[in-house]
Interface confidence: medium
């Protein structure tokens, strides 16, 4: 008799999930000498242990602690780039500006980027059919709890000037419900972080508005100021030119506003 299986609203575990996590771990530790000591077998065991045989709506940050411990990594605390709803450009930026880091440039962020995973209560199976959706099913699912945990730790580690890239094409440029708005903003440490500098990325070619005056940006400024952290904001009118000028700062066209 086929066993009844919980049907969730979200997509199931990414195909070849174990192999992908392992492959990414091996690749990352080969490329980053400071992480060569990491044993990818132990990393996989800790990752698996966080969600296998557990109810996928009952995952806690505590479940991920063994993985967090294994993935402990020191990144320069004054070179952190947060992002919200504009991941691709943030990643393109840190690929060029190699001394800056997004969460996905760290081992744990890199392992899980773009992946979905969940298990089933009381079985050692990975559920490839469906996983809980954050809105429709539950927020304490394996993926959401993972990102909440690593995002909190990443924000807590930041110091000096922290940058955040925001998507100026969205109706809510700053969204309180995003990971940045709900987790990272509230875990920046005022005793370490002097300034949060927002880069608002413009979508339209002819968009010359000052999006730093957007009501949601003012809301972000208010939240940050109340936490005794200074706030500054810059419009990035031409993201393509911005990346080009990061690559070639000597270019004569890079002295004008981007």
């Amino acid at each position: 008799v086929p066993r009844w299986r919980q049907q969730w609203s979200g997509p199931g575990t990414t195909k070849r999930f174990p192999e992908t996590v392992l492959a990414r771990c091996v690749k990352y530790t080969e490329i980053h000498p400071e992480m060569r000591h990491v044993d990818c077998q132990s990393v996989w065991d800790a990752f698996k242990g966080a969600f296998i045989s557990k109810h996928p709506c009952n995952i806690t940050e505590e479940d991920y602690q063994p993985l967090m411990k294994l993935g402990t990594q020191t990144v320069p605390c004054n070179k952190i780039l947060l992002w919200s709803r504009i991941k691709d450009l943030a990643h393109q930026f840190t690929q060029v500006q190699r001394d800056m880091f997004t969460l996905e440039d760290t081992l744990l962020g890199y392992l899980a980027d773009d992946l979905t995973w969940c298990g089933e209560f009381n079985t050692s199976k990975i559920n490839y059919q469906s996983c809980p959706d954050w809105r429709k099913d539950c927020s304490n699912n394996p993926v959401s709890v993972f990102w909440k945990t690593v995002s909190r730790r990443f924000a807590e580690a930041a110091c000096d000037v922290v940058h955040v890239m925001l998507n100026g094409s969205r109706s809510k440029i700053f969204d309180k419900n995003s990971t940045f708005g709900s987790v990272e903003v509230h875990n920046l440490q005022p005793e370490k972080v002097q300034t949060l500098e927002a880069w608002v990325i413009h979508g339209g070619r002819e968009d010359s508005r000052d999006l730093c005056q957007d009501p949601t940006i003012k809301e972000l400024e208010s939240i940050i100021s109340k936490r005794n952290i200074q706030f500054s904001c810059k419009n990035i009118y031409r993201p393509d030119k911005f990346l080009q000028c990061v690559k070639n700062p000597e270019d004569s066209s890079c002295t004008s506003e981007i």
Epitope: P18, E19, L22, R24, V26, E30, Q41
Partner: antibody, heavy 125, light 107 residues
């Protein structure tokens, strides 16, 4: 530095089986995939499949499905490839190779580095 | 499966000359291509991965380029030890497949 050392040449009769070994040294055997690639005389290199020792999972190319079995012994850091129901066209040099991960936005690319020295399997009546 | 076609089948050149080898994929494979060198009686050796990244210890005279369906391996100045067979391999899609090879021999 990882090194892969394969077992010696074999001469087999049609219909029989052959088992080739590949011993790894100088690296973390369990976390890497070990692939098997063959090269028949005058033919292109042909990927047969692989094993990921940490999971014990295997992937076989459809052409070899049902005839090839890839296994690994973690205790001796050795991978094995067994090919059954041998025919003359299976005469080839069989290589094991460790999978090296390259770039790739989702699943890192799979390249082969390093390779074993190769094992010549001759199928003849 | 993705078919890789290499050309020319044989390239005759002299030491010091520039050699350009081509690999064409039957469908787009992004930059998911590698090049190997194989000398008689030896196993293949990884030269280039991810279309253009030289593998560890590979001399700078070897370079790779291309994306999509057209790829090139260039040897800027052939040395005596470079006369060998060169294979391309794709990792975009399973099964992983190799090209038929280009033999670079001495003119």
């Amino acid at each position: 530095q990882v090194q892969l050392v394969q077992s010696g040449a074999e001469v087999k009769k049609p219909g029989s089986s052959v088992k080739v070994s590949c011993k790894a040294s100088g690296g973390n055997f369990i976390s890497y995939s070990i692939s098997w690639v063959r090269q028949a005389p005058g033919k292109r290199l042909e990927w047969m499949g692989w094993i990921i020792p940490i999971f014990g999972t295997t992937t076989y190319v459809q052409k070899f499905q049902g005839r090839v079995t890839i296994t690994a012994d973690e205790s001796t850091s050795t991978a094995y490839m067994e090919l059954s129901s041998l025919r003359s066209e299976d005469t080839a040099v069989y290589y094991c190779a460790r999978v090296k991960y390259g770039s790739g936005s989702y699943y890192p690319n799979n390249w082969f580095d390093p390779w074993g020295q190769g094992t010549l399997v001759t199928v003849s009546s | 499966e993705i078919v890789l076609t290499q050309s020319p089948a044989t390239l005759s050149a002299s030491p010091g000359e520039r050699a350009t080898l081509s690999c064409r994929a039957s469908q787009s494979i992004s930059s998911n291509l590698a090049w190997y060198q194989q000398k008689p009686g030896q196993a293949p050796r990884l030269l280039i991965q991810d279309s253009s990244t030289r593998a560890t210890g590979i001399p700078a005279r070897f370079s790779g380029s291309g994306s999509g369906t057209e790829f090139t391996l260039t040897i800027s100045s052939l040395q005596s030890e470079d006369f060998a067979v060169y294979y391309c391999q794709q990792s975009d899609n399973w099964p992983l497949t190799f090209g038929g090879g280009t033999k670079v021999d001495i003119k």
